[in-house]
């Protein structure tokens, strides 16, 4: 009797088990009693990830440059386009349809992990001991200058945004 | 329900053109499958001779030496056998099948 | 071109036994994906073939579960496990994985 459920990559359709076009591939006509399945390969610029039964390809991710995108990875008849961000951007989500500059650490925070075209500045607070006077997209926080090492002493002590101001020790007269 | 219909003449003279017709009602020969003429001489097995696919492109049996065309007429959902240079040898009953449905046949004479 | 040879030729059976044919082919049936295309029709006297079995071992829509097909790659039997009075006629096999398409040369079954 004809079957109620199919292989894997197989599918049901008119009471036959057809196979699946595979990835790369998108269906022409499904099988029949005394024929398979027909399948043709995707166009340049289109693509299937999956064994599938799609009349038609998907067209690979365009990475528009006036959106800051740029190609990471080519598309293949199996696998779509990667876009990444120019130099100075990250994308705005996982599927990167766009870009935006990457965020400064204001002074008083040191950047704890450098941008990259998919992922954002992560800023940090100098801890105690530390500072950062600048706003900037790549600077740590920086430790407070050791005055004792240079023979002096703190004269102004430091914060997270400023260095400490060492002076010469008062000498005893 | 698919029905298949034959037609053409009856009667074909010797190292001429045997022409059939055959109307498919119930099912559109663009929509999938591949639409065969099968023949029987009389008293004798079945032959294969070739099919029009749904897309149109074309299969035919090598012992038929190049004297076959099928060819259809999508507006009309009907394809078509034409066999050339016919001997006493191509006397027959031609069927036109889907290979699930087939016409009822028609007998075709070679003949002076 | 696939040839396909069925034995017996003929078979007289009484009304309620079984009867079994073979269809052996030239070469494998099997393609690439593992699937097999192998026909069985009965055409009775003065009638087009009607198909029976598909794909080996499919019963086509309304055929009687007395009929049942088996087999693989190069061997194939029909089986009727209870011959009743209309089952009188020639059964053909029929290869449709290789093209050309190629028919067994029947085998003519009779009631005893």
């Known amino acids: 009797e004809p079957p109620t459920a199919c292989r894997e990559k197989q599918y049901l359709i008119n009471s036959q088990c057809c196979s699946l076009c595979q990835p790369g591939q998108k269906l022409v006509s499904d099988c029949t009693e005394f024929t398979e399945t027909e399948c043709l390969p995707c166009s340049e610029s289109e693509f299937l990830d999956t064994w599938n039964r799609e009349t038609r390809c998907h067209q690979h991710k365009y990475c528009d440059p006036n959106l800051g995108l740029q190609v990471q990875q080519k598309g293949t008849s199996e696998t779509d386009t990667i876009c990444t961000c120019e130099e100075g951007l990250h994308c705005t989500s996982e599927s990167c349809e766009s870009c935006v500059p990457h965020r400064s650490c204001l002074p008083g925070f040191g950047v704890k992990q450098i941008a990259t075209g998919v992922s954002d500045t992560i800023c940090e607070p100098c801890p105690v001991g530390f500072f950062s006077n600048v706003s900037s997209a790549f600077e740590k926080c920086r430790p407070w200058t050791s005055c004792e090492t240079k023979d002096l002493v703190v004269q102004q002590a430091g914060t997270n945004k400023t260095d400490v101001v060492c002076g010469p020790q008062d000498r005893q007269r | 329900e698919v029905q298949l219909q034959e037609s053409g003449p009856g009667l074909v003279k010797p190292s001429e053109t045997l022409s059939l017709t055959c109307t498919v009602s119930g099912y559109s020969i663009t929509s999938n499958y591949y639409w065969n003429w099968i023949r029987q001489p009389p008293g004798k097995g079945l032959e294969w001779m070739g099919y029009?696919?749904?897309?149109?492109?074309?299969n035919y049996n090598p012992s038929l030496k190049n004297r076959v065309t099928i060819s259809r007429d999508t507006s009309k959902n009907q394809f078509s056998l034409k066999l050339s240079s016919v001997t006493a040898a191509d006397t027959a009953v031609y069927y036109c099948a889907r290979l699930d449905y087939w016409g009822q046949g028609t007998t075709v004479t070679v003949s002076s | 071109d696939i040839v396909m040879t069925q034995t017996p030729l003929s078979l007289s059976v009484t009304p309620g036994q079984p009867a079994s044919i073979s269809c052996r082919s030239s070469?494998?049936?099997?393609?690439?994906?593992?699937?097999?295309?192998l026909n069985w029709y009965l055409q009775k006297p003065g009638q087009s073939p009607q198909l029976l079995i598909y794909r080996v071992s499919n019963r086509f829509s309304g055929v009687p579960d007395r009929f049942s097909g088996s087999g693989s790659g190069t061997d194939f039997t029909l089986k009727i496990s209870r011959v009743e009075a209309e089952d009188v006629g020639v059964y053909y096999c029929?290869?449709?994985?290789?093209?050309?398409?190629?028919f067994g040369q029947g085998t003519k079954l009779e009631i005893k």
């Open positions: 070469q494998s049936l099997e393609n690439t994906n593992g699937n097999t295309f």
């Open positions: 029929l290869q449709v994985t290789h093209v050309p398409f190629t």
């Open positions: 029009i696919r749904y897309d149109g492109s074309n």
